[in-house]
Interface confidence: low
């Protein structure tokens, strides 16, 4: 029944696999979190030799921008006081590309560049063409209306005789390829003779014009090739460390990234904050649950309830303000002094007045809440949609008789959502080698250290089987009940005969991951050797001569 | 206005259980986490645990591992923290708090539930 | 977890500092948030992600990090600044917060 020579010398090498297979196992359960750690950070770096430098370069997503126009319904009832009624039109969509140029290495560990956008119609995902009319509130003249208010009436006088004969009225009735892009308007001229520079348009004004086939300043960012812990975070823009639209510093701070990849190794206590050239303002959003998109685990980030909150309400954003009602934002001083406001869309999570004020808006948070969601390991945006709304403040004004007996009110003119999620090639390579390639290390590293202990019990296994053969049945009771620790035995282990030692101390603990709850390999090892002890000799029949015994 | 209305003081003997309670009023429930604290006398503050109420996911603090229970009933928009076995060092002032500012900054407290474990 | 001195003083007017000593896991990686407790009431966020302060908090209050060392400042003191206060921040080891013992102030 014993084992032969040349079975102990198998039973030993395979012993001596096991203990490799096992060792190798516990070095990749400490070694391969901190080798998967080495590469993401040698990996996201701004730097041509990192594997997501094209991806930063030329992003190979695509994003789509998604308009919504709000239809003016009664624009002559509103000039009569009555409150607005608007129809939602849309979704016109555009495919959006991005590229960056003008890329220079500083020696600061960072880098500059610029990154131009162009956009192109997509009649296939959109709800209308592009030649839809649509009325709007014509900005340009209730706009003008607003910031005239407090000039004197003479001003305003020549202003209205202006508009007059330029024939401008409060609204107007114009494509939606128009209002994007631009049209012609004589009161543009008008404003950049009268008024050189105030204006960001020369011959036409529409409200996405600026954004087509242009840049959205410099941005100067972190490599994160000297110092990972800034990766990413904005250094600059147009040169400026700050910016000097708002009334306090801290709402004038540039913190954050520009809103494309953010550091790796997030935590749900991260925070994502970008700085947004359109908004004229750092954003923060914030961590509200995690997800899985197309198989990669990810971290959804939304807007806080205090994004657009009013300095009552969140003190913090006093410096955004003057301030109307809580959940929108004044942009005018980045805006060409134009009485425009940023919000959600449909005025969700704003002031309730605000959506009440006009007839035909529906805020839902499903519809019009904006998120990103993240992978949290490399700060890679997998999957997002930044939902956002422009309206125009306008009110009757003394002595601009264009603006009627309109009451105040922030009317919505668009809103618009910004989407991209990864797909295609870049997704499968993005799973294979973030996903699924440490999955199978982390799979293998627990399979080598099982394989291990199993083939380490073989010598065991052999050796108490030799003895079984012996026929020393009070030795062999004597030996099971050593081999079981805590039962009777006092300072002899489990492994046996001199040839064996225990394995080493890395290969004795085995940790959950995340836990923080350990357990000794030791017993769990001990315990599958009694067992094996107590059953062996019960299957070979010699069951009675064990009857004392039990496993633990 | 986000708050968090504590349950009163309890007194317990030593080995017994006592459940407090913490409602929040003033936002929905589920949009926040609940973390339960500890104020011992002469220790300082200790995180115990807390809970997600959208999904009654919890995380303990090792050192109340297994004899802290949080639960959270989203019908009433209350959390609950139970302690078991309770010892003289129990004897402590334990707030429920949530971090609308991000890591570890608890913005909104409860008023605290003086706990007393005595013979 | 995180280390602070047990007391501080300063007459009305003067500046006073509170130190908070922590570690890699905590300070380290992560933003530091203050607390002033009033006796008898419960802990009320002072500064939060390192130098914001809390709504409500008075610009008198100011705070920093340098690698795992973190600082508030309160210039101008006042009486009604005497409190108990003490510094948070979350652990990676403990994946959770961890607090300082507090330093009390006190107003001369």
């Known amino acids: 029944m014993g084992c032969s020579a040349k079975a102990r010398w198998a039973a030993g090498a395979l012993g001596v696999a096991g203990l490799l297979c096992a060792v190798l196992g516990a070095v990749m359960i400490v070694m391969v979190p901190s080798l998967i750690k080495q590469q993401v950070l040698k990996n996201v770096r701004i730097d041509p030799s990192s594997l997501s430098f094209n991806m930063w370069k030329e992003i190979p997503i695509p994003f789509y921008l998604s308009v919504y126009f709000f239809d003016v319904m009664n624009p002559s009832e509103i000039l009569k006081g009555e409150k607005p009624q608007v129809r939602e039109r849309g979704p016109y969509v555009y495919r959006e590309f991005r590229h960056k140029s003008n890329i220079t290495f500083n020696n600061n560990d960072t880098v500059s560049f610029l990154e131009y956008r162009t956009f192109q119609f997509q009649p296939s995902k959109s709800h209308g063409s592009e030649s839809d009319y649509i009325v709007m509130p014509n900005i340009l003249v209730l706009g003008a209306a607003v910031m005239m208010e407090n000039k004197p009436m003479t001003l305003k006088l020549i202003m209205t005789l202006a508009f007059t004969t330029l024939g401008e009225r409060a609204f107007m009735n114009r494509t939606v390829g128009e209002i994007m892009w631009g049209y012609k308007d004589p009161l543009v001229n008008l404003i950049n003779k009268y008024f050189p520079g105030m204006f960001p348009f020369k011959d036409k004004f529409g409200l996405f014009a600026e954004l087509n086939n242009s840049d959205s300043g410099l941005f100067t960012v972190f490599t994160g090739v000297q110092n990972i812990s800034r990766i990413h975070l904005v250094d600059k823009w147009n040169g400026l460390s700050k910016v000097d639209f708002w009334h306090s510093d801290q709402c004038n701070m540039i913190n954050g990234t520009s809103g494309q990849m953010w550091p790796p190794f997030m935590t749900p206590e991260s925070s994502l904050e970008f700085y947004s050239p359109e908004a004229c303002r750092s954003m923060k959003l914030m961590y509200k649950e995690s997800g899985v998109f197309e198989g990669i685990p990810t971290y959804r980030f939304v807007a806080p309830k205090t994004l657009f909150a009013n300095g009552s309400i969140y003190p913090p954003n006093e410096g955004f303000c003057p301030c109307l009602e809580s959940g929108i934002q004044n942009v005018s001083t980045c805006r060409f002094s134009a009485p425009l406001f940023l919000s959600h869309p449909h005025f969700l999570n704003a002031d309730p007045v605000l959506a009440e004020a006009v007839t035909g808006l529906h805020p839902n948070q499903e519809a019009h809440s904006l998120f990103l969601d993240i992978h949290p390991v490399t700060g890679i945006p997998m999957n997002c949609s930044v939902k956002l709304q422009l309206s125009l403040y306008m009110k009757s004004v003394a002595g601009i008789g264009q603006t009627g007996k309109i009451e105040p009110v922030v009317l919505p003119l668009l809103w618009f959502a910004e989407s991209g999620a990864m797909e295609g090639e870049t997704l499968h390579t993005f799973y294979t080698q973030l996903v699924l390639m440490p999955k199978v290390m982390h799979y293998a590293q627990y399979v080598l250290l099982a394989l291990g202990c199993v083939l380490l019990l073989v010598p065991v296994i052999c050796q108490i089987r030799s003895q079984v053969g012996a026929g020393q049945r009070a030795a062999r009771a004597d030996s099971h009940s050593l081999a079981c620790w805590g039962k009777g035995a006092s300072d002899r282990t489990l492994w046996p005969t001199a040839a064996w030692s225990p394995p080493p101390a890395a290969v004795l603990r085995l940790c959950r991951s995340g836990s923080g709850h350990c357990w000794g390999l030791r017993s769990t090892l001990a315990s599958f050797a009694c067992r094996v002890a107590t059953t062996l000799p019960v299957l070979e029949g010699l069951g009675p001569s064990l009857g004392g015994g039990t496993g633990s | 206005e986000v708050q968090l209305v504590q349950s009163g003081a309890e007194v317990r003997k030593p080995g017994a259980t006592v459940k407090i309670s913490c409602k929040l009023t003033g936002d929905t429930f589920t949009d926040y986490f609940i973390f339960w604290l500890q104020l011992a006398p002469g220790k300082g503050l200790q995180w115990m645990g807390l809970?997600?109420?959208?999904?009654?996911?919890?995380i303990y603090a090792e050192k109340f591992q297994g004899r802290v229970a949080i639960t959270a009933d989203t019908s009433t928009d209350t959390a609950y923290m139970e302690v078991s076995s309770l010892r003289s060092e129990d004897t402590a002032v334990y707030y429920c708090?949530?971090?609308?500012?991000?890591?570890?900054?608890?913005?909104?407290w409860g008023r605290g539930t003086m706990v007393t474990v005595s013979s | 977890v995180l280390t602070q001195p047990p007391s501080a003083s300063g007459a009305p007017g003067q500046r006073v500092t509170f130190s908070c000593s922590g570690s890699?896991?905590?300070?380290?990686?992560?933003?530091v948030n203050w607390y002033q407790q009033l006796p008898g009431a419960a802990p009320r966020l002072l500064m939060h992600t390192t130098d914001q302060r809390a709504s409500g908090a008075p610009d008198r209050f100011s705070g920093s990090k340098s690698g795992t060392s973190a600082s508030l400042a309160i210039t101008g003191l006042q009486s009604e600044d005497e409190a108990d206060y003490f510094c948070?921040?979350?652990?990676?080891?403990?994946?959770?917060?961890?607090f300082g013992g507090g330093t009390k102030l006190t107003v001369l």
């Open positions: 708090a949530t971090d609308s500012v991000g890591a570890a900054g608890f913005d909104v």
């Open positions: 890699g896991s905590n300070i380290g990686s992560y933003t």
């Open positions: 809970i997600d109420p959208k999904d009654a996911q919890t």
């Open positions: 948070a921040a979350w652990d990676d080891s403990l994946d959770g917060p961890v």
